[in-house]
Interface confidence: medium
């Protein structure tokens, strides 16, 4: 796995422990919490990041506090089970043997059950709508400049293939970024839209996951773009299933 050779750190994930114990003395980095080796040339999966966050000392957790809407699960943060690739396991359980099914971004999509609950597959979140409201500015941003800057950001900072940024909409003061990535479209090595959205969200909240970099300084033609509200709409390939009991709770 590539990492900064000079001081052996992981540029794309500061929640790692790195040491030159890889093959040939190469720098190898492992995610906190899971101990899984991570590829520092790309984004770390959201599952491993959440696991790392939960492993942080309680007093340190506030430093990486989730944004108000980071995990849009009513139950807030949880310590997730990740598969060998670092993806969320379809079934998640807590320490009291309460289980539920999640989607590919780790959001609960069924009622809670016991250990007998079956989650046959990890349902993919294939459409993410990121809704941002920016702070007042002297005038509206130029739409095409804004579009280009946000596409550049996702391409360069988050390494998301441009074809997965479906659209950037703007109507002052609201910006919407549409990310789309069906299972069939995602090739090996492609960054997952859920991971890119999570990194972006943390950046926007001033809680960057990147090692040693300054926070996100988003500018459109030199004008700072400061976000005051973030909402995320997650659309799954298969809609969530909740009982009517959940609806009336």
């Amino acid at each position: 796995h590539t990492a900064a050779q000079d001081n052996c750190t992981c540029p794309t994930n500061k929640m790692t422990v790195c040491s030159p114990d890889g093959p040939g003395g190469r720098c190898q980095c492992r995610a906190l919490g899971s101990g899984m080796a991570v590829d520092c040339s790309t984004l770390t999966s959201k599952c491993l990041l959440l696991k790392a966050r939960m492993s942080a000392p309680k007093n340190a957790r506030t430093l990486v506090r989730p944004s108000e809407h980071a995990l849009v699960d009513n139950d807030g943060l949880y310590d997730p089970d990740c598969d060998p690739e670092g993806r969320f396991k379809a079934r998640q359980c807590n320490q009291t043997s309460v289980c539920w099914c999640v989607n590919s971004v780790g959001v609960r999509r069924t009622d809670k059950g016991d250990l007998s609950l079956r989650c046959d597959e990890l349902v993919r979140t294939h459409h993410i709508l990121i809704d941002l409201r920016h702070r007042p500015t002297a005038g509206a941003f130029n739409h095409s400049d804004l579009d280009a800057e946000l596409r550049r950001l996702f391409r360069e900072r988050y390494r998301l293939h441009p074809k997965f940024v479906a659209a950037v909409h703007y109507e002052q003061p609201t910006i919407q970024i549409e990310l789309r990535q069906n299972t069939s479209q995602k090739a090996a090595g492609d960054v997952d839209i859920g991971d890119a959205a999570y990194y972006f969200e943390r950046d926007i909240k001033g809680e960057s996951l990147f090692q040693g970099r300054g926070g996100l300084d988003l500018r459109v033609r030199g004008e700072p773009l400061q976000v005051e509200r973030t909402l995320i709409y997650y659309l799954d390939e298969i809609p969530p299933k909740f009982s009517m009991k959940r609806l009336t709770a």
């Epitope: 659209a167 909409h169 919407q176 909402l231 969530p240």
Partner: antibody, heavy 121, light 111 residues
Amino acid sequence: EVQLVESGGALVQRGGSLRLSCSASGFSVRNNYITWVRQAPGKGLEWVAIVFPGGSSYHADSVKGRFTISRDLSKNSVYLEMNSLREDDTGVYFCARDSGSPLWRGHFQYWGQGTTVTVSS
Amino acid sequence: QSVLTQPPSVSGAPGQRVTISCTGSSANIGAGYDVHWYQQLPGTAPKLLIYDNNKRPSGIPDRFSGSNSGTSATLGITGLQTGDEADYYCGTWDTSLSAWVFGGGTRLTVL
């Protein structure tokens, strides 16, 4: 003037199929969020399906796998293909459009008059 | 059975002010998703009354207002008129269900 006209509602046997149409005028369905919302007799509103300007679609859990929303840009129309119909699918089906903003705001500003689907056993 | 809870009915005399509540959860209103209100007169299609919590589409009189706080939203109607007799629905996005949801509706009667 923005207009939405639904058609295709009928009385159908349980397990049967129907295709509802929503014919749009005064705007292009290509650039708008078009939604189907239904209302069972004497009941409230229930969101059914949506097609985004980019063409992707999304369905409610209650109809997923049975209903399919689609659009025909040449006819400036949106459709709801309904299969494996059940009694609880009975109701008035409305076609609705957003405000026309390039943003998805989650509200439905323009509505058709509705078309009635009755599923009998 | 609705994700958003509304009182089944409210009433008021002409000229009075009434409010209709819409109670959700941290998965919808409480998460910051905008609330929209619809009016449905008997035998007609719904009509957008309030959008984005408190904005009125053109043509909607300022007698109608919207607000929200925490996990609830409220529709206010002042100067009640007999023509306001209708069913009123709130709607928003629910992130747990990944769906657009409506309240069960409130029947307004003008006495």
